[in-house]
């Protein structure tokens, strides 16, 4: 598994990571850490493992965390209720 750097699918990344779109270069996907407490997220980001190619630049939240709405269009990783 690739620990960091370019990837195409989640299976190429290490544990606790997903293969997300680079925030710098949209045509590149990089192994990215899953969302920690307080990180921005999107509730429809594909769960790990996803067998296709992601479009989002964020990964889903780490196990035990949920992507919850904090204001109209803002979601962050928070402890599951």
């Amino acid at each position: 598994a690739v620990i960091t750097g370019a990837c195409d699918k989640d299976s190429q990344c290490g544990g606790g990571m997903c293969c997300a779109v680079s925030i710098w270069v949209k045509s590149i996907r990089i192994c990215t850490p899953m969302g920690k407490l307080g990180d921005s997220c999107h509730p429809l980001t594909r769960k790990v493992p996803f067998f296709g190619r992601r479009m989002h630049h964020t990964c889903p939240c780490l196990p035990g965390l949920a992507c919850l709405r904090t204001s109209f269009n803002r979601f962050i990783c928070l402890a599951q209720k």
């Epitope: 779109v21 949209k26 999107h42 509730p43 429809l44 980001t45 594909r46 769960k47 493992p49 996803f50 067998f51 296709g52 190619r53 992601r54 479009m55 989002h56 630049h57």
Partner: antibody
Framework: EVQLVQSGAEVKKPGASVKVSCKAS????????MHWVRQAPGQGLEWIGY????????TYNQKFKGRVTITVDKSTSTAYLELSSLRSEDTAVYYC??????????????WGQGTLVTVSS | DIVMTQSPDSLAVSLGERATINCKAS??????????MNWYQQKPGQPPKLLIY???NLESGVPDRFSGSGSGTDFTLTISSLQAEDVAVYYC?????????FGQGTKVEIK
């Protein structure tokens, strides 16, 4: 060739439950999610929910929460939709549809032929 | 829920002419510079068929006379040169927020 073959038409009484099956073939079943969509006679499309065929995780339209259950049987590559407490407004064609794995676009690229569920007393 | 409103409800176009269908979302369906909008075609007695995903990406095997555009709340499906086999109902669908919602459909006929 990707194929989704659904079970046959059902006639149910109000208050009853129905379980529709969708047998997949021609691809790696666990690599793709499966959606369920319904269409009332002469009406538009309504998304019911989807399931990860890899781990069984589900996401439901809140409108159906508590009445709908989506499951998969990996050993037979079959997805199921169960809808309980049926009412006349549930009369519709129910479709299973494979998610195309286009990232977060959640696009449904292959569809079953549809199953007509009629709810009538 | 995000409400999708298509216009017009029906459209009659001559063979070989351009057909344009509009879809308006009640709130933006964009995220991270992508637009989360799909388009489907449904012919009588058949299941829907995916035409366009993520606003502008043509599904494999779909003729290139079909194209999708737009962002935010306003989207368009264009058939550049209508063919007889394009007679159908067309639906937009947003997939940026759960529940995924469809427009009411636009019926395209031959004039």
């Amino acid at each position: 060739e990707v194929q989704l073959v659904q079970s046959g038409a059902e006639v149910k009484k109000p208050g009853a439950s129905v379980k529709v099956s969708c047998k997949a073939s021609g691809y790696s079943f666990t690599d793709y999610d499966m959606h369920w969509v319904r269409q009332a006679p002469g009406q538009g499309l309504e998304w019911i929910g989807y399931i990860s065929c890899y781990n069984g995780a589900t996401t439901y339209n809140q409108k159906f929460k508590g009445r709908v259950t989506i499951t998969v049987d990996k050993s037979t590559s079959t997805a199921y939709l169960e809808l309980s407490s049926l009412r006349s407004e549930d009369t519709a064609v129910y479709y299973c549809a494979r998610d195309g794995n286009y990232g977060e676009a959640y696009a449904m690229d292959y569809w079953g032929q549809g199953t007509l569920v009629t709810v009538s007393s | 829920d995000i409400v999708m409103t298509q216009s017009p409800d029906s459209l009659a176009v001559s063979l070989g002419e351009r057909a344009t269908i509009n879809c308006k979302a009640s709130q933006s369906v964009d995220y991270d510079s992508d637009s989360y909008m799909n388009w489907y075609q449904q012919k009588p007695g058949q299941p829907p068929k995916l035409l366009i995903y993520a606003a502008s990406n043509l599904e494999s095997g779909v003729p290139d006379r079909f194209s999708g555009s737009g962002s935010g709340t306003d989207f368009t499906l264009t058939i550049s040169s209508l063919q007889a086999e394009d007679v159908a109902v067309y639906y937009c669908q947003q997939i940026n927020e759960d529940p995924f919602t469809f427009g009411q459909g636009t019926k395209v006929e031959i004039k």
